[in-house]
Interface confidence: low
């Protein structure tokens, strides 16, 4: 239907800032009725383009801990198992919105951030350079 | 590391839910010097896993626009250009954090939610089951 | 290309009845909620009337309450202006425009896509 | 008469900041975010600005806007010839229950 006018039991904002300051409940609500395939898939290993997960820490953070895909080889796993470097394990990249603690160290003040994460990888075709 | 004292500047917080709701401040820092990869690049048309960027909107989230990676195949692209259906396009899934307007329809008072989205596409070897 | 071509404009008597379309093509017109908005000579923009994405809810200014009907064929991608009793002040550019969300939503998104528009003139 | 004030009119000089306001009222600004709509003279008006300062793919990041309270502005930081136009912020006002353009503001590059 039509966009509801605003919900009378909004909070007021008497913030200058308004709306660039906002209150968030960090009680996460999960809209995945399923556990997160990333961890429960073993796509990593399987992959032509396998990867390793490392674990990036920052208490400072909102969610505090984060899983960097990093792509184990230049090249990608042909057939034979072997790793052909005609091909390329390329990172696949995503910004993801995080919350920064601002002031350094308050509990209940954060900036929303934008970071850079590799979810995984994938083969891609390299381009090539031709010298004339 | 150690867990650093409170800063003494932080915002006090008398609400009754604290820490569960805080503030948040909109103004997104970008920690990423460069463009967003996953724009810039054209892994989604070179993998051996290619795979469509599709617009998924919703004003009721911040942020508003997510992009969301459909295979274009069930098979991998092989050396000749053609669909190899021995082997699997998957995609690669991330939890995300995006903020929900609660109350609807309010502009200053989110939840934070976690939502799956699909990042890009990656080809693995299809698990085979064996029947006796 | 996204694209919205409104037809039916013209010169018409004051208490007299037209009809005025627009053409959708270059995305999935029933997924978007749609306005139209006019602009009177030497004025600024006036809303007139928003249409949900299915037809279900309809919006209208006051100043055109109960004389325009808003409507939408979303089997010929087509929003309609059906506007009855035209008045002088009615004289105005008439565009349609699409909501920047899919959905239920008719404002977080602004309308990102307009067409050219369409002249009304009512007048004896 | 508009639900949304805007001042008749604005200008600078190239490169030069100009500010722009445009104030309602617990209905409709109070309630609801901002978008922005520029208008070149004989052309059909161009989405500049919408939800939390969030700006379509093409329009310059010379452009921003703030909100607070009852009012908005938009700023144009950089003024160049090509920002000559008509500005007009619109929202959604409740107690019309629809949707409301500001009176308009427009921008002389000097």
């Known amino acids: 239907g039509i966009t509801i006018p605003r919900n009378p039991g909004c909070p007021n904002s008497e913030d200058k800032n308004f709306p660039r300051t906002v209150m968030v409940n960090l009680n996460i609500h999960n809209r995945n009725t399923n556990t997160n395939p990333k961890r429960s898939s073993d796509y990593y290993n399987r992959s032509t383009s396998p990867w390793n997960l490392h674990r990036n820490e920052d208490p400072e953070r909102y969610p505090s801990v984060i899983w960097e895909a990093k792509c184990r080889h230049l090249g990608c796993i042909n057939a034979d198992g072997n790793v052909d470097y005609h091909m390329n394990s390329v990172p696949i990249q995503q910004e993801i919105l995080v919350l920064r603690r601002e002031p350094p160290h308050c509990p209940n003040s954060f900036r929303l951030e934008k970071i850079l994460v590799s979810v995984g990888c994938t083969c891609v075709t390299p381009i090539v350079h031709h010298v004339a | 590391g150690i867990t650093i004292p409170r800063n003494p500047g932080c915002p006090n917080s008398e609400d009754k839910n604290f820490p569960r709701t805080v503030m948040v401040n909109l103004n997104i820092h970008n920690r990423n010097t460069n463009t967003n990869p996953k724009r810039s690049s054209d892994y989604y048309n070179r993998s051996t896993s290619p795979w469509n960027l599709h617009r998924n909107e919703d004003p009721e989230r911040y942020p508003s626009v997510i992009w969301e990676a459909k295979c274009r195949h069930l098979g991998c692209i092989n050396a000749d250009g053609n669909v190899d259906y021995h082997m699997n396009s998957v995609p690669i899934q991330q939890e995300i954090l995006v903020l929900r307007r609660e109350p609807p329809h309010c502009p200053n008072s989110f939840r934070l939610e976690k939502i799956l989205v699909s990042v890009g596409c990656t080809c693995v070897t299809p698990i085979v089951h064996h029947v006796a | 290309e996204v694209q919205l071509l409104e037809s039916g404009g013209g010169v018409v008597q004051p208490g007299r009845s037209l009809r005025l379309s627009c053409a959708a093509s270059?995305?999935?017109?029933?997924?978007?909620?749609m306005h139209w908005v006019r602009q009177a000579p030497g004025k600024g923009l006036e809303w007139v009337a928003v249409i949900s994405y299915d037809g279900s809810n309809k919006y209208y200014a006051d100043s055109v309450k109960g004389r325009f009907t808003i409507s939408r064929d979303n089997s010929k991608n087509t929003l309609y202006l059906e506007m009855n009793s035209l008045r002088p002040e009615d004289t105005a550019v008439y565009y349609c425009?699409?909501?920047?969300?899919?959905?239920?939503?008719?404002?977080?998104?602004?309308?990102?896509?307009w067409g050219q528009g369409t002249t009304v003139t009512v007048s004896s | 008469q508009s639900g949304l004030t805007q001042p008749p009119s604005a200008s600078g000089t190239p490169g030069q900041t100009v500010s722009i306001s445009c104030s309602g009222s617990?209905?409709?600004?109070?309630?609801?975010?901002v978008n922005w709509y520029q208008q070149v003279p004989g052309a059909a008006p161009k989405l500049l600005m919408y939800?939390?300062?969030q700006r379509p793919s093409g329009v310059p990041d010379r452009f921003s806007v703030s909100q607070s309270g009852t009012s908005a502005s938009l700023a144009i930081s950089g003024l160049q010839s090509e920002d000559e136009a008509d500005y007009y912020c619109a929202t959604w006002d409740d107690s019309l229950g629809g949707y409301v353009f500001g009176s308009g503001t427009k921008v002389t590059v000097l």
């Open positions: 617990n209905s409709n600004i109070g309630s609801h975010s």
């Open positions: 939800g939390i300062g």
């Open positions: 425009a699409k909501v920047g969300a899919s959905g239920d939503y008719y404002y977080s998104y602004g309308l990102d896509v």
């Open positions: 270059g995305f999935i017109f029933s997924n978007y909620g």
